[in-house]
């Protein structure tokens, strides 16, 4: 039930120490001050697709 610290988060989400939880990066453009948004900036968005095979 309770994720360990810095748990691996699914694509499009990032770990929040503040909330002890993986959080959705989609909220970051509107609310950029969330601590998990720092992790979102380092990873490609969930809808990212490779442009080559």
């Amino acid at each position: 039930e309770q994720a360990p610290g810095n748990a691996p988060c699914s694509s499009g989400s990032s770990w929040s120490a503040d909330l002890d939880k993986c959080m959705d990066c989609a909220s970051c453009p509107a609310r950029p001050h969330s601590d998990f948004c720092l992790g979102c900036a380092a990873a490609p968005p969930a809808h990212f697709r490779m442009l080559w095979p």
Epitope: E1, G5, A17, R31, H33
Partner: antibody, heavy 123, light 111 residues
Framework: QVSLKESGPGILQPSQTLSLTCSFS??????????VSWIRQPSGKGLEWLAH???????RYNPSLKSRLTISKDTSRNQVFLKITSVDTADTATYYC???????????????WGQGTSVTVSS | DIVLTQSPASLAVSLGQRATISCRAS??????????MHWYQQKPGQPPKLLIK???NLESGVPARFSGSGSGTDFILNIHPVEEEDAATYYC?????????FGGGTKLEIK
Amino acid sequence: QVSLKESGPGILQPSQTLSLTCSFSGFSLSTSGMGVSWIRQPSGKGLEWLAHIYWDDDKRYNPSLKSRLTISKDTSRNQVFLKITSVDTADTATYYCARRGPDYYGYYPMDYWGQGTSVTVSS
Amino acid sequence: DIVLTQSPASLAVSLGQRATISCRASKSVSTSSYSYMHWYQQKPGQPPKLLIKYTSNLESGVPARFSGSGSGTDFILNIHPVEEEDAATYYCQHSRELPWTFGGGTKLEIK
């Protein structure tokens, strides 16, 4: 306008189960990022965080009390519940619920608190 | 658990002067870009009221005479100039990791 209000039994005996209800308005616990915590304060003493429930029904507990605590919610009725089993006189306190949700910037402060409900454990 | 130690436990400050309250954490509650420390004011018979979030961000509606600073393990709440309505107990709280804990409180009296 956000508001929260706690309710409980007032007085109960040692070894019984304490059941508390937090009824709130002005926000939805189905909103992504939203959560509600329970905090208690013995008379004249400091604050102790007990448990937190998230919009997606994820839960967190204070490890020192985890075996005795159960937090739950009824999103449609705007209520959060806390049960504490096997209460003792040390559980005598004012119990608060507080909202923790995203503000305009994306901070997650414990920004709104209920007035608290007083609980006395006595034989 | 991260233990938060507030000092002093109580203080008396003359009207218009500066009140300084310290909160020391048993381990860092900051990262390179974030500090997870918050301050509350509580008056008798009332719930705590959020004053400052994330070290230095004033909550909406809180007067500008309140300010917060610090990083790592050492944090400060300043009130200047102190007004009569500031008589209360002040608590620090962190959200760096579980469990979220509070300091023991500092009672401010206005002289």
